[in-house]
Interface confidence: medium
């Protein structure tokens, strides 16, 4: 007989977490982000839905939109116009993507306390927003931009082109929305509210993807998205500004593409306004090696906006992809000429560097092996940014002023010191200039969110500390969180593990590796969390492990392009070498390892698991991506090159899970997806489960119908979790 | 390659017209502003007009204005001059330069015209 | 419209020298706005820098380009026996664009 499986916490009057209190979010903490709309004033939501207005300086506070106005049209997020006269109401929120939704919008008029009635907005609109000053709004409505001077008047139609999946203006389309911009608008105000920039989109070459949706109907429904994979014909995008003061004098005017890019197939990136005529626009060829910075003047005499050749500035990565995940942006001094952006430095590490004429004459502002991952704000004479610096943790985020009024430059670290042990994890939200910002902290510890002086960096109060949380969680017995790096051969792994609650190194113990391990994706971080394997660790007594290998971000370039043009080799060696460590560690049982992911994580977990090591016991692939063909070419084509005889087809195809069906033979596998995913297609599950069926290899699955890439639905997620759980329990012989 | 070739040029008498063309490849030319710019012989260089990439906005040198008219077609890639009225002082080489505003990048060949009688 | 004016007319040089080429705005111009091409006789003017200092594609690294202002120059470094031509600057800040009168490089 072998002895009993079951994991007791002892002498502890506490209680280990549940897998319902994870479903029922019982211990989830809050941050503040302060909504700033001055140098010193700011919006906030209250907990009862009130929307209150703060004075830093004065200390006043007032509701100036009440929940009983909110409630009146079903409110759950509000927007003011920059002359204070009026706010947006959203109501009948309907997600579509990861960031796009539709909504109906209402014009509440805080002068004289009513909705603002006549030429009402149409529903359900697409994109809505203020222009930077004043109350003029632009919104998106049927793929097609439209423009009110007032709420009151009557609407100027902008684009005329739009039309459902086949021409996007001002909003991006699926591929550009997930992969390039991260947001549900392609439209920018210029700072003065004249000029607005948009995108068009047309993707009427795009080849369709189309799944069920089963809905209650008699018939399902057939959802159709032009959704470029790998090496298929991609959105052909321009960039237009119109003047919105005159918008029926002159059309919208073109933004020429710089030619070094125009040659070839190429994407837009992103679009900065630097002064009220004068905007940068970023572009990036479909080989995404070259990104091209591209400076443009309004020509008031031309009515034209021009690119100067000396004016585009070129990066270029010889060892993988431009960028980190996204190229980064630049953050233009006051000058409107110069800037300062994130790139890689020679040794490949990503660090700040001032660009006044040319890249190649850039001035390198920070330096080290270590990164620099997000300029905040630049000011007359300060700069604010975020690294991985402090005391060599690649996942920490602290925040750090550069005094660029100084000379030489001088560096301070605002938050180093602040809560040492609680805080190692922040970032920041400024007011317009720096005046005040908040600041919020992620963890290790609870989540705290603080206000300061943009001068002197002193605290000013506590937003947000997670009172509540930390009471709740006194009577809970917490796994034990390490932070920890691991050698092998030439080569350094960061890793997470979470140790049951009175865990004992003389005892074993059944190991779960969670893996993302995508390309520019961090795992190891240093951020509070009560999540699945929190409980696994502290109800089940199983030990969790998350390993950054190679592929993964904020390490330099050298970690980061190991896996430039062959996805799906580094990443799962390094999670297999991190195994063996662990087993050398001696607390680990070594006939009780199991190996999870979700997404690029199922892609990993499921490729170790046919690494025909016999590491593994069990798995599961949630939504894995199963060939690189299947997935978005953007996404796809950074990493991987082309799917082509004469580029990269051979590793396309030898990377597939599929290729690997047969030794999945001595494992458990367990394969879940969502039947409605517009991310990962149902389509890569069922060519895994295709191919098992093939190789008539046993294994489980699970569907989840008309779920998405997240199987968020609450009935959805806590069957999601409560099935992976009992899998595992039975995969450890833990009993129920 | 980007290329221009113009055409059209000749032996014109005074007050009479001539057309030129342009016919451009080796660049989006939808998306690009073109000029026409002139030589006298032996002279120095001198702009004449200029049309947006669309071709709903044109410029004039006051010296042709009222009487020469700047045109495109897209889908032929092609640029045309139209010059009416002619002169003696309208003989040149007639250049077709890709750009309009900070720099000509591209330049045609050319093409004589010769007013004279 | 601004004038641009170019010294010398003429400049008498051999081959291994260096030139020097001067070009006045009769008002400020941006540096964005200012180019300068290079003509032989019988062909068609060369884009040689624009941005007032940034070479244009294929152009050797012995010219080079400075100024601002109203006041910008155009350097050969070492001319070589293919640099002998007529160059011009440009600007394009204003409608209409216009062009220096040229300065003729010849072989001394």
């Known amino acids: 007989l072998r002895p009993s499986r079951v994991y007791k916490p002892e002498g502890n009057t506490k209680r280990a977490l549940t897998l319902k209190d994870i479903l029922n979010g019982t211990f989830s903490y809050k941050t503040y982000f302060p909504n700033w709309i001055s140098e010193q004033e700011y919006l906030h939501q209250s907990e009862d839905d009130n929307i209150v207005f703060y004075n830093i300086e004065t200390r006043e506070s007032y509701i100036i939109l009440s929940n009983s106005t909110m409630k009146s049209v079903n409110a759950t997020d509000y927007g003011l116009s920059p002359d204070r006269q009026f706010v947006y109401l959203e109501s009948d929120y309907s997600k579509l993507w990861r960031y796009s939704y539709t909504a109906t919008y209402y014009i509440y008029d805080l002068q004289n306390g009513e909705f603002v009635r006549g030429y009402e907005l149409p529903r359900p609109i697409q994109y809505l927003c203020w222009s930077p000053v004043g109350s003029k709004l632009a919104y998106v409505y049927q793929n097609n931009i439209y423009l009110k001077q007032r709420p009151g008047d009557p609407p100027f139609q902008i684009t005329y082109t739009g039309r459902e999946n086949r021409i996007f203006n001002g909003i991006p389309d699926w591929v550009y929305e997930e992969e390039m911009l991260a947001t549900k608008y392609a439209l920018w105000w210029s700072p003065d509210g004249k000029f607005l920039a948009y995108v068009e989109f047309n993707d009427s070459d795009i080849p369709i993807i189309a799944y069920s949706y089963y809905g209650d109907g008699q018939y399902p429904r057939t959802i159709n998205i032009p959704y470029p994979k790998a090496g298929a014909k991609n959105p052909v995008v321009r960039v237009f500004i119109v003047d919105t003061t005159y918008p029926h004098h002159v059309g919208p005017m073109e933004v020429p593409v710089p030619e070094m890019i125009a040659s070839s197939d190429y994407y837009f990136s992103w679009l900065t306004w630097v002064s009220s005529e004068r905007v940068c626009l970023q572009w990036l060829k479909r080989v995404q090696n070259v990104s091209v910075l591209s400076i443009c003047d309004f020509r008031e005499d031309w009515h034209a906006w021009e690119c100067p050749k000396n004016q585009e500035h070129v990066e270029e990565s010889r060892t993988g992809w431009a960028g980190g995940f996204f190229v980064s942006t630049p953050a233009f001094s006051q000058d409107a000429t110069s800037y300062y952006k994130i790139f890689s430095d020679k040794d490949g590490y990503k660090h700040i560097h001032y660009i006044k004429d040319t890249v190649e004459n850039a001035i390198q502002i920070t330096s080290g092996k270590w990164e620099a991952i997000y300029i905040f704000r630049v000011t007359q004479d300060s700069l604010f940014y975020s690294s991985n610096e402090f005391e060599g943790y690649p996942g920490r985020r602290n925040i750090y002023r550069i005094s660029i009024g100084n000379s030489p430059p001088s560096k301070k670290c605002v938050t180093c010191h602040l809560r040492k042990e609680r805080c190692q994890y922040y970032t920041a939200s400024f007011s317009y200039k720096a005046k005040y910002y908040a600041l919020v902290c992620y963890g290790p510890g609870l989540p705290i969110s603080t206000l300061h002086d943009g001068r002197t960096d002193q605290e000013i109060q506590v937003l947000e500390e997670n009172k509540e949380l930390e009471n709740s969680l006194r009577n809970i017995q917490l796994p034990k969180v390490e932070i920890k790096k691991l050698k092998d051969g030439g080569l350094t792994f960061w890793y997470k593990m979470i140790l049951p609650p009175q865990f004992d190194r003389s005892k074993k113990y059944p190991l779960l590796i969670q893996v993302y391990g995508g390309p520019c994706s961090q795992s190891v971080k240093s951020v509070f969390a009560v999540n699945w394997i929190t409980y696994l660790a502290s109800k089940e007594g199983i030990v969790i492990a998350l390993v950054d290998g190679r592929g993964t971000a904020f390490q330099g370039d050298k970690f980061l392009h190991a896996v430039y043009r062959k996805l799906g080799v580094y990443e799962v060696e390094d999670q297999l070498t991190a195994v063996r460590k662990f087993i050398e560690m001696g607390f680990i049982d070594e006939e009780r390892i199991a190996i999870w992911g979700w997404s690029y994580g199922g892609y990993v977990s499921s490729l170790a698991l046919a690494s025909g090591t016999g590491l593994f016991k069990c798995g599961i692939a949630v939504a894995p991506v199963s060939s690189w063909e299947y997935y978005a070419s953007i996404y796809s084509e950074r990493f991987m090159g082309l799917p082509t005889k004469d580029d990269n087809l051979e590793h396309y195809k030898n990377s597939t899970v599929m290729a690997r069906a047969e030794y999945f033979r001595n494992v458990d596998y367990l394969l879940i997806h969502g039947t409605a995913d517009d991310n990962v297609h149902f389509q890569n599950s069922a060519q895994i489960a295709k191919a098992l069926v093939n190789a008539q290899v046993d294994f489980q699955a699970m569907w989840y119908s008309d779920q998405n890439h997240g199987i968020s639905s609450g009935r959805s997620q806590n069957h999601l979790y409560t099935h992976m759980t009992h899998f595992l329990k039975q995969c450890f012989s833990l009993s129920d | 390659e980007v290329q221009l070739l113009e055409s059209g040029g000749g032996l014109v008498q005074p007050g009479g017209s001539l057309r030129l063309s342009c016919a451009a490849s080796g660049f989006t030319f939808s998306s690009y502003a073109m000029s026409w710019v002139r030589q006298a012989p032996g002279k120095g260089l001198e702009w004449v007009s200029a049309?947006?990439?669309?071709?709903?906005?044109?410029y004039y040198a006051d010296s042709v204005k009222g009487r020469f008219t700047i045109s495109r077609d897209n889908s032929k890639n092609t640029l045309y001059l139209q010059m009416n009225s002619l002169r003696a002082e309208d003989t040149a080489v007639y250049y077709c330069?890709?750009?309009?505003?900070?720099?000509?990048?591209?330049w045609g060949q050319g093409t004589l015209v010769t007013v004279s009688s | 419209e601004i004038v641009l004016t170019q010294s010398p007319g003429t400049l008498s040089l051999s081959p291994g020298e260096r030139a020097t080429l001067s070009c006045r705005a009769s008002q400020s111009v941006s540096r964005s706005y200012l180019a300068w091409y290079q003509q032989k006789p019988g062909q068609a003017p060369r884009l040689l820098i624009i941005?007032?200092?940034t070479r244009a594609t294929g152009i050797p690294d012995r010219f080079s380009g400075s100024g601002s202002g109203t006041d910008f120059t155009l350097t050969i470094s070492r001319l070589e026996p293919e640099d002998f031509a007529v160059y011009y600057c440009q600007q394009g800040q204003v409608i209409p664009p216009t062009f220096g009168q040229g300065t003729k490089v010849e072989i001394k």
């Open positions: 049309i947006s990439g669309s071709g709903g906005s044109t």
């Open positions: 330069a890709k750009g309009w505003l900070g720099n000509f990048d591209y």
């Open positions: 941005g007032a200092s």
